[in-house]
């Protein structure tokens, strides 16, 4: 990969091992855990990153009310099965043969079952709502400055096309970033909103996935934007299928 050529490292993914063992002795970077060669000029898929992480030697408001069908990643970390494209396989199972269906960001969207569980297709997450609460500041941030800074961040750091950042809402101290990307909108080479959201989430937690770059230093007009809590909601093109028992719990 040309992005990794100079000193054989992967700028966009520190969870790789790079070696001059590609065609013609070129630098090639493989994701930990899966061994899949990754493109270091763009973001690595969330599935490969999760696999690498598991294998590594660790009222009239402007705010959006998440839809009743929105999913939150309550299950936490697991060692996923990725397809040859690096995407999540629709059906995931653990070591004890408990299986469940996931969406394109790897979040469970059905009740857990056994090996007979069928997941016919990988359902796309087309709308992601990132809900942030920032630490107290002297005053509120200017909404348009905040909007511009977050859009710049997603465009420059995560290489997400600006058209996929649908909106930035702000009601101190809550910031909401809406990412939208339908299957029909996503062209070859476009960063997936799920991958961008995952990189952002890890950045916010101080666990940057970028090689050698400093952590995320978010500033709005020179004022540090420090996030104290993050909640991410995922909305799928087809609503999830949970039993009533879970919905009423």
């Amino acid at each position: 990969h040309t992005a990794a050529q100079d000193n054989c490292t992967c700028p966009t993914n520190k969870m790789t091992v790079c070696s001059p063992d590609g065609p013609g002795g070129r630098c090639q970077c493989r994701a930990l855990g899966s061994g899949m060669a990754v493109d270091c000029s763009t973001l690595t898929s969330k599935c490969l990153l999760l696999k690498a992480r598991m294998s590594a030697p660790k009222n009239a408001r402007t705010l959006v009310r998440p839809s009743e069908h929105a999913l939150v990643d309550n299950d936490g970390l697991y060692d996923p099965d990725c397809d040859p494209e690096g995407r999540f396989k629709a059906r995931q199972c653990n070591q004890t043969s408990v299986c469940w269906c996931v969406n394109s960001v790897g979040v469970r969207r059905t009740d857990k079952g056994d090996l007979s569980l069928r997941c016919d297709e990988l359902v796309r997450t087309h709308h992601i709502l990132i809900d942030l609460r920032h630490r107290p500041t002297a005053g509120a941030f200017n909404h348009s400055d905040l909007d511009a800074e977050l859009r710049r961040l997603f465009r420059e750091r995560y290489r997400l096309h600006p058209k996929f950042v649908a909106a930035v809402h702000y009601e101190q101290p809550t910031i909401q970033i809406e990412l939208r990307q339908n299957t029909s909108q996503k062209a070859a080479g476009d960063v997936d909103i799920g991958d961008a959201a995952y990189y952002f989430e890890r950045d916010i937690k101080g666990e940057s996935l970028f090689q050698g770059r400093g952590g995320l230093d978010l500033r709005v007009r020179g004022e540090p934007l420090q996030v104290e809590r993050t909640l991410i909601y995922y909305l799928d093109e087809i609503p999830p299928k949970f039993s009533m028992k879970r919905l009423t719990a």
């Epitope: 990969h1 054989c8 091992v17 070696s19 001059p20 063992d21 590609g22 065609p23 013609g24 002795g25 090639q28 930990l32 855990g33 899966s34 061994g35 899949m36 060669a37 990754v38 493109d39 763009t42 030697p57 990725c82 397809d83 040859p84 494209e85 690096g86």
Partner: antibody
Framework: QVQLVQSGPEVKKPGASVKVSCKAS????????LGWVRQAPGQGLEWMGN????????NYNEKFKGKVTITADTSTSTAYMELSSLRSEDTAVYFC?????????WGQGTLVTVSS | DIVMTQSPDSLAVSLGERATINCKSS????????????LAWYQQKPGQPPKLLIY???TRESGVPDRFSGSGSGTDFTLTISSLQAEDVAVYYC?????????FGQGTKLEIK
């Protein structure tokens, strides 16, 4: 030129362990993946796992987990593959190989015979 | 795991004739990031380690005679020997190194008719 030289044949009793070595020369040992491949008598090739000596990252084929341990000593540019709790089914030729798109470099193979 | 299936299991071809070995993988071996197929072909003679012939599905390893060629993409691959020579008698294996665990085909034994 690149060379991988493996240790000699071994005869072991069931239940014993064996450690096969693979000494690399002619290239920078720490920056290439090195894999181990098994070939039972008259059978095909099976990938057992690999190691990246520079950072000691190791991957195992699920089939061989608990049976094989792969290590490397960067000071001597030598990789090791240890088989534990040997059974007759472990009788095979074991190869080390430098991995990668254009890595046509294999050791000569080490025959491990398990017999009571 | 990716399953590699070769056909035929054995093949007898006359000297100077074309020999064709097929390899089918259970999942695509095409990496969308770099458009590279992670498939290699090896030749193994009795008592010897495998010898790399082709990598990236179609790139000939240096020193390999040009009668050997590889083709295919995704899940279907072919190794062709355009004019069989006596020294080509061996077992041929395809291998995926796309995703762990790397896997080999069961092998194709090539003989002279």
């Amino acid at each position: 030129q690149v060379q991988l030289v493996q240790s000699g044949p071994e005869v072991k009793k069931p239940g014993a362990s064996v450690k096969v070595s693979c000494k690399a020369s002619g290239y920078t040992f720490t920056i290439y993946w090195l894999g181990w491949v098994r070939q039972a008598p008259g059978q095909g090739l099976e990938w057992m796992g690999n190691i990246f000596p520079g950072s000691a990252y190791i991957n195992y084929n699920e089939k061989f987990k608990g049976k094989v341990t792969i290590t490397a000593d960067t000071s001597t540019s030598t990789a090791y593959m240890e088989l534990s709790s040997l059974r007759s089914e472990d009788t095979a030729v074991y190869f080390c190989a430098r991995e990668g798109s254009n890595s046509g470099y294999w050791g000569q193979g080490t025959l491990v015979t398990v017999s009571s | 795991d990716i399953v590699m299936t070769q056909s035929p299991d054995s093949l007898a071809v006359s000297l100077g004739e074309r020999a064709t070995i097929n390899c089918k993988s259970s999942q695509s071996l095409l990496n969308s990031g770099n458009q590279q197929n992670y498939l290699a072909w090896y030749q193994q003679k009795p008592g010897q380690p495998p010898k790399l012939l082709i990598y990236g599905a179609s790139t000939r390893e240096s020193g390999v005679p040009d009668r050997f060629s590889g083709s295919g993409s995704g899940t279907d691959f072919t190794l062709t020997i355009s004019s069989l020579q006596a020294e080509d008698v061996a077992v041929y294996y395809c291998q995926s190194d796309h995703i762990y665990p790397y896997t080999f085909g069961q092998g194709t034994k090539l003989e002279i008719k």
